[in-house]
């Protein structure tokens, strides 16, 4: 579970077709 | 301007421990995630590890996990790097580096002069 | 386990065009990054995004990627671009991949 003071912190994960991106990469979602 | 400075590095044992710093100015620290890359003598670069916004989003490279930690202090503007239990193959110069800023940040946009560790007995 | 494969070496004479490449399986479905680095100092992003420049690249270096191989590309190359050259991709979140590098020599 995340702690409090990261709620509201982007994560940053790797995946494909992810934040407006055709291919494979990091993408970082509230 | 935008510079990052790399500190704590040195010579030691196998078996030993140290902590890198590395001191960010002249951008908004706590809004960009930062890795670490290293480069032994002569060699390629490996990356090491990252820390994203958040405290608890971080990622190592198989060939260090378990054995080191990244962290960070944004209210100091500082990465760290702890590294326990050397080997004679983490011997390198150690970088830090910024990742690029927005919501998708594959590149290192900005690295450290770096730091020699070197690791012997 | 994924490699990004580069050639050690490749030499262009000034003014020619230097190509350099980097491959890897599947490494056209990811973006590729490359970064130069002169003798004795610490890299410096040239391309992202595949074909991205970062404010103060010059115009002559551009990139590609498709298939297994991206692709770096340098028009009129000039002295001061002799160094090395390495790419990199993300493979997992936890697999950050850089080429081994590739020497540019400017005859």
């Known amino acids: 579970r995340r702690r409090r003071r990261d709620t509201h912190f982007p994560i940053c994960i790797f995946c494909c077709g992810c934040c407006h991106r055709s291919k494979c990469g990091m993408c970082c979602k509230t | 301007q935008v510079q990052l400075v790399e500190s704590g590095g040195g010579v030691v044992q196998p078996g030993r421990s140290l902590r890198l710093s590395c001191a960010a100015s002249?951008?908004?620290?706590?809004?960009?995630?930062m890795h670490w890359v290293r480069q032994a003598p002569g060699k390629g670069l490996e990356w090491v590890a990252v820390?994203?916004?958040?405290?608890?989003?971080?990622y190592y490279a198989d060939s260090v996990k378990g054995r080191f930690t990244i962290s960070r202090d944004n209210s100091k503007n500082t990465l760290y790097l702890q590294m326990n239990s050397l080997r004679a193959e983490d011997t390198a110069v150690y970088y830090c580096a910024r990742a690029q800023e927005g919501i998708a940040p594959d590149a290192f946009d900005i690295w450290g002069q770096g730091t020699m560790v070197t690791v012997s007995s | 386990s994924y490699e990004l494969t580069q050639p050690p070496s490749v030499s262009v004479s000034p003014g020619q065009t230097a190509t350099i490449t980097c491959s890897g399986d599947?490494?056209?479905?990811?973006?590729a990054c490359w970064y130069q680095q002169r003798p004795g100092q610490s890299p410096v992003l040239v391309i992202y995004q595949d074909i991205k420049r970062p404010s103060g690249i010059p115009e002559r270096f551009s990139g590609s990627n498709s298939g297994n191989t991206a692709t770096l590309t340098i028009s009129g190359t000039q002295a001061m671009d002799e160094a090395d050259y390495f790419c990199q991709a993300w493979y997992s979140s936890t697999n950050v991949l850089f080429g081994g590098g590739t020497k540019l020599t400017v005859l």
């Open positions: 599947k490494l056209g479905e990811r973006y």
């Open positions: 820390i994203w916004y958040a405290e608890s989003n971080k």
């Open positions: 002249g951008f908004t620290f706590s809004s960009y995630g």
